[in-house]
C-alpha cells in the first residue's frame, strides 16, 4: 500500500514529504528511516530534524527543499540498487502516538545508459564528461565513464534521454502533506 | 478539524460478535494510528488494541485473549473492532482515538441476552 | 505486562488547593508516561505527554514530573471544573496500560 517512486542507478531519488507548520518557524521533530515505520520513532534513521535544526544525517541522505517552511523530502544522492526499498518519513507531533508516519516505496532500476567498453577514446577535451540531468535541487549528474565511438549527434541524443528519464520521475505534483494545528 | 465518531449495535448476545465502526475525518487517515479502549460501567480505562492504516499494522491487549480483530476500509476512513464470543464482561464503552490525543465520543455496548 | 499503580484512589480538595497525584510504572518507562482527565459521560482528554509536556491548550495549573518508574500530577490550584477522574497512562510498550484512576472532587 506504500506509494512507489522511481530513480535510475546513479541519479538522486526524490521521496516527497510535507507538513505545514502552524507557525512559521513552529517547527515541529522529523525522522526519515530504511524501512516501514514502526511504532515509535524510526528505524535505521539516516536523517533528523528537531524544532530547529537537521541534527543528524548520514552520507548521501539529505534535505533539499526548505524544512523550515515544511518540505521535509529526502534526497538520496547517486543511488544505487541497494537503494530499493521502503522508506519512513514521521512527522514527530506532539502528543501520545500522535505522529503522521509516511512509507514510501523507492524502486531502482539500472541506468538506461551502460555503453559496452569498446574502443576507448577520451572525449574530456570535446565533452564533459558528466551530462547534467533535471531534478530537484543541485544539478544531478550522470556519469558517461569511457564512451565508445559516437558523433556528436549521438551525444545530444543522449543527453536528452537522460534528461527526459529524469523528468519522467519528476514527482513534484506528488507526495504526503499534512497540516499542524 | 480532527473528528471520531463510533458506531455500533447497542445490544449484543452473549457469544456473538461485536462489532463497531470508527470513522475518522479532518486528517490524512492513512497516515496515524488509530487506539480502540473500553471503559466498563463506573470502571478504569482498558486498552484494547491499536492499528496503523498506513500498513495495517496491529497489536492486541493479550487480555483479550485473541477475541479481538482490529482492521480498516481505507476507502471510507473508517476503522473496525470485532469482538467474539461476549460475555457480560465486555459491556462497555467503547472508544476509538486517533494516536490518544484526539477521542470519539464513545458508544455504549451492552451485552445481554 | 507493565502495571500501573496510582495514588490515592480518591481525594478531596478546597478551590485553590495544591493537589498531587502519584503514579508507579513495575518497571522503567522512560518518561513515556501520559496523565488524562475524564469527566462523567465524556472522553479521556489528554493534559500530559511525555511525563512533563503540557499539552497545547491545557491550563498552566497543570503538571507533570517524574521518571524511570515514578511519576507525579499536580494541580497547583485547584478550580472547581477540574472536577473529574484522572488517569496515568504508560506508552513505552505494548500493551499500553491505564492507572486504575483518582477521583478529584471538591469539599
Known amino acids: 500500500s506504500e506509494v512507489e517512486y522511481r530513480a535510475e542507478v546513479g541519479q538522486n531519488a526524490y521521496l516527497p514529504c510535507f507538513y505545514t507548520p502552524a507557525a512559521p518557524g513552529n517547527l515541529v521533530p522529523v525522522c526519515w528511516g530504511k524501512g516501514a515505520c514502526p511504532v515509535f520513532e524510526c528505524g535505521n534513521v539516516v536523517l533528523r530534524t528537531d524544532e530547529r535544526d537537521v541534527n543528524y544525517w548520514t552520507s548521501r541522505y539529505w534535505l533539499n527543499g526548505d524544512f523550515r517552511k515544511g518540505d521535509v523530502s529526502l534526497t538520496i544522492e547517486n543511488v544505487t540498487l541497494a537503494d530499493s526499498g521502503i522508506y519512513c518519513c514521521r512527522i514527530q507531533i506532539p502528543g501520545i502516538m500522535n505522529d503522521e508516519k509516511f512509507n514510501l516505496k523507492l524502486v531502482i532500476k539500472p541506468a538506461k545508459v551502460t555503453p559496452a567498453p569498446t574502443r576507448q577514446r577520451d572525449f574530456t577535451a570535446a565533452f564533459p564528461r558528466m551530462l547534467t540531468t533535471r531534478g530537484h535541487g543541485p544539478a544531478e549528474t550522470q556519469t558517461l565513464g569511457s564512451l565508445p565511438d559516437i558523433n556528436l549527434t549521438q551525444i545530444s541524443t543522449l543527453a536528452n534521454e537522460l534528461r527526459d528519464s529524469r523528468l519522467a520521475n519528476d514527482l513534484r505534483d506528488s507526495g504526503a502533506t499534512i497540516r499542524i494545528g | 478539524q480532527v473528528q471520531l465518531q463510533e458506531s455500533g449495535p447497542g445490544l449484543v448476545k452473549p457469544s456473538e460478535t461485536l462489532s463497531l465502526t470508527c470513522k475518522a475525518s479532518g486528517y490524512t487517515f492513512t497516515s496515524s494510528d488509530i487506539n480502540w479502549v473500553r471503559q466498563p460501567p463506573g470502571k478504569g480505562l482498558e486498552w484494547i488494541g491499536w492499528?496503523?492504516?498506513?500498513?495495517?499494522?496491529?497489536k492486541y491487549n493479550p487480555s483479550l485473549k485473541s477475541r479481538a480483530t482490529l482492521s480498516t476500509d481505507k476507502s471510507k476512513n473508517q476503522a473496525s473492532l470485532n469482538l467474539s464470543s461476549v460475555t457480560a464482561a465486555d459491556t462497555a464503552v467503547y472508544f476509538c482515538a486517533r494516536g490518544l490525543d484526539y477521542w470519539g465520543k464513545g458508544t455504549t455496548v451492552t451485552v445481554s441476552s | 505486562d507493565i502495571q500501573m499503580t496510582q495514588s490515592p484512589s480518591s481525594l478531596s480538595a478546597s478551590v485553590g488547593d495544591r493537589v498531587t497525584i502519584t503514579c508507579k510504572a513495575s518497571?522503567?518507562?522512560?518518561?513515556?508516561l501520559g496523565w488524562f482527565q475524564q469527566k462523567p459521560g465524556k472522553a479521556p482528554k489528554t493534559l500530559i505527554y511525555r511525563a512533563d509536556r503540557l499539552v497545547d491548550g491545557v491550563p498552566s495549573r497543570f503538571s507533570g514530573s517524574g521518571s524511570g518508574q515514578d511519576y507525579t500530577f499536580t494541580i497547583s490550584s485547584l478550580q472547581p471544573e477540574d472536577i473529574a477522574t484522572y488517569y496515568c497512562l504508560q506508552y513505552d510498550e505494548f500493551p499500553l496500560t491505564f492507572g486504575p484512576g483518582t477521583k478529584v472532587d471538591i469539599k
Open positions: 492499528i496503523f492504516p498506513g500498513d495495517g499494522s496491529t
Open positions: 518497571q522503567d518507562i522512560n518518561s513515556y
